[in-house]
């Protein structure tokens, strides 16, 4: 199963950690994809490690663990984020987070 905070908020200009927690007694994680709506942010694979999409390379830092740290947030970053865990032999598990970026006070 995937466990995640459904709704999170952060300040404009700040950073936020996007985290999905996968728990299974048997399945091993082989790949994790992170998307902002339909756009890929980063991908982790056991073979190749982390790769961050070039369009986000100055704002997205892999980690902690299989999560992402999203920096220099703008109001346009408000929206849905999806983690997809590819596991063996368990199959594919998805999690959803809604991020609300608020104006800095």
């Amino acid at each position: 199963t995937i466990d995640t905070k459904r709704n999170i908020s952060a300040e404009e200009g700040g950073s936020v950690i996007l985290q999905c927690h996968f728990s299974s007694d048997t399945a091993e994680v082989t790949q994790v994809d992170w998307k902002q709506q339909d756009q890929l942010l980063a991908i982790y694979s056991v073979d190749l490690g982390w790769h961050v999409a070039s369009v986000f390379s100055d704002r997205v830092v892999p980690g902690p663990s299989l999560g992402l740290t999203f920096q220099s947030l703008t109001m346009n970053d408000t929206g849905e984020y999806f983690c997809t865990y590819h596991t063996y032999p368990g199959g594919i598990y998805k999690g959803r987070i809604f991020l609300k970026v608020q104006e800095s006070s």
Partner: antibody
Framework: EVQLVESGGGLTQPGKSLKLSCEAS????????MHWVRQSPGKGLEWVAF????????FYADAVRGRFTISRDNAKNLLFLQMNDLKSEDTAMYYC????????????WGQGTLVTVSS | DIVMTQSPSSLAVSPGEKVTMTCKSS????????????LAWYQQKPGQSPKLLIY???IRFTGVPDRFTGSGSGTDYTLTITSVQAEDMGQYFC?????????FGDGTKLEIK
Amino acid sequence: EVQLVESGGGLTQPGKSLKLSCEASGFTFSSFTMHWVRQSPGKGLEWVAFIRSGSGIVFYADAVRGRFTISRDNAKNLLFLQMNDLKSEDTAMYYCARRPLGHNTFDSWGQGTLVTVSS
Amino acid sequence: DIVMTQSPSSLAVSPGEKVTMTCKSSQSLYYSGVKENLLAWYQQKPGQSPKLLIYYASIRFTGVPDRFTGSGSGTDYTLTITSVQAEDMGQYFCQQGINNPLTFGDGTKLEIK
């Protein structure tokens, strides 16, 4: 400033062992995958081994698998390469190198330590 | 293992000239997961360790002068130096990141006339 400093190289005979060390500073060592890459005199670069940050996953080049062991001590910011049953073809400059967080390259290199295997 | 073939093996140019070197891989370096080509270029000056110049085939690494340009996709890649300077002398290596073991080309040696 990221710094990687290798040590432990030297002259040794075929069949003997050496242990290389790489001291890291200027970054959160425990968060990064680390590699050993070697370069024979006047030749190109050859990747040797890597060790992942959290998982400790390791991978070796065929030429060294079963003879070399990569390890790390995150508390002391140290990377190691234990080299056993050395052969003359292992003679090279050995570099430790850092993999950046977002792509499969080497963004920081040490100055290297020279290993010479000769009878 | 993926074989990386660089050409030419060496070249000599005068300061200010444009230089092009190529790197061919034995299989595609396109990673559909991240929609990037996993090809990097390094510069190694005599007596020094290599330095990362380009990653994802075309993105200049931090602090790399804009006279260095990477291009290409699939199996064919190019590094261009638009106006060569004396300090650009050295060896240039390409490296693939799509498969373990990671592999390098044999290098192109750039000499300044």
